[in-house]
């Protein structure tokens, strides 16, 4: 806490500029007007203030806005954002995607700090739902964001937002999450033609039911083994040998290498040996 002292004569800051880096902490406290600081926040980032000086500037803003900073100030916080605590951020009402991007940019290259986690939560709550633009922004900065949400939270994601999802955003999603995301993806991509549809839906197929896999087997999709191995075991088990052969196309030969792994292992055990023999791969049920 900085003591209240009168500003020395001639030291009153008429604007936020580089001359302030030579001010001692107590001089900054006494000579910089908080309202001026708030209106010229965008200049702070261009000035090489020390961490201690930034603490004083933050203190001034906290005194000016005890109920939380307005968005006009938040958007221009820049590196001062790194000084904020989760408690500070909980007082904010961030509604602009530009503000969110600006603050995530400041944190870029850093890890997901408690401050950033709080900021994202406040923003998403304020929006009411995870719309496409928000999801696009969050996954660009944190590709694992989507897979951190619970199935319950994912259920409120509108299908239109699924267009923002890239395959790498689903890398760490678990089967429960894919069970929620798959029907949304199916709805989002329903008007695409066969091959384009398969390219888009492929990453979500870990949540696909048997009937959808059967339908895909009729469309010459040539699913690769990596995708097949991520399918739900309970969805694969009812497929016939002929359906799996159609689903995989030329990749069907890869079943041999995966015969001891789920879901291939369990599927093989469900098939008649005569049917397996038609594949000519030497699979033993």
């Amino acid at each position: 806490e900085v003591e209240k002292t009168a500003c020395p004569s001639g030291k009153k800051a008429p604007e936020i500029d580089e001359s302030l880096i030579f001010y001692k902490k107590w001089e900054l406290e006494a000579c910089v007007d908080a309202a001026l600081l708030a209106t010229q926040m965008d200049r702070v980032n261009a000035i090489p203030f020390t961490y201690e000086q930034l603490d004083v500037l933050k203190h001034k803003l906290d005194e000016l806005y005890p109920q939380g900073y307005p968005e006009s100030v938040i958007q221009h916080l820049g590196y001062l954002f790194l000084k904020m605590s989760p408690e500070d951020i909980r007082k904010w009402n961030v509604t602009s995607l530009e503000t969110l991007k600006a603050l995530l940019e400041v944190n870029k290259g850093h890890e997901m700090s408690p401050q950033v986690a709080t900021l994202i939560d406040r923003f998403v709550k304020g929006r009411g739902q995870l719309d496409k633009d928000t999801l696009d922004t969050l996954t660009a900065f944190y590709p694992g964001y989507l897979c951190s949400l619970s199935p319950e939270e994912l259920s409120s994601v509108p299908p239109s937002s699924i267009w923002a999802v890239r395959p790498q955003d689903l890398d760490t999603c678990d089967p429960r999450q894919l069970d929620v995301l798959y029907p949304k993806a199916r709805l989002a991509f329903q008007n695409m033609n066969g091959s384009e549809y398969f390219v888009k839906i492929q990453s979500f197929l870990g949540g696909a039911p048997t009937e959808d896999l059967k339908a895909l087997s009729q469309q010459n999709v040539s699913m690769d083994l990596a995708t097949f191995m991520k399918l739900r075991t309970d969805a694969v088990l009812p497929l016939t040998v002929a359906e799996v052969q159609k689903l995989l196309g030329p990749h069907v030969e890869g079943l041999k290498a995966e015969e001891r792994h789920r879901p291939v292992r369990d599927w093989i055990l469900r098939q008649r040996q005569d049917d397996l023999d038609t594949l000519g791969l030497g699979l033993q049920g």
């Epitope: 890890e111 408690p114 944190y142 694992g144 619970s150 199935p151 939270e153 760490t172």
Partner: nanobody, 111 residues
Framework: QLQLVESGGGLVQAGGSLRLSCTAS????????AKWFRRAPGKEREWVAS???????GYDDSVKGRFTISRDLAKNTVYLQMNSLRLEDTAVYYC?????WGQGTQVTVSS
Amino acid sequence: QLQLVESGGGLVQAGGSLRLSCTASGSTSMSYGAKWFRRAPGKEREWVASVYRDGTTGYDDSVKGRFTISRDLAKNTVYLQMNSLRLEDTAVYYCTALNSWGQGTQVTVSS
């Protein structure tokens, strides 16, 4: 890049217990949840358990009722309490959070 370090693995008899830990480096928040996966010898990687952003949890059917996932935000750590261990639980256990992966910790269950 987020650094995750797993620990707590080891050799245990069938029916025994182990507690795995996954700690995130630096100022990283575990408030965005984490997951445990495992890879048994000669098998594909499989999901074990998740603790999600909102604190709810999920488990693969094979471990439900035996394993418990939890997190301590103050310690930036996620735990996997494994009880009633079976031979088929033998695997390298990996922790993942926000698309980052740890190096894994070996769990071996003997008869």
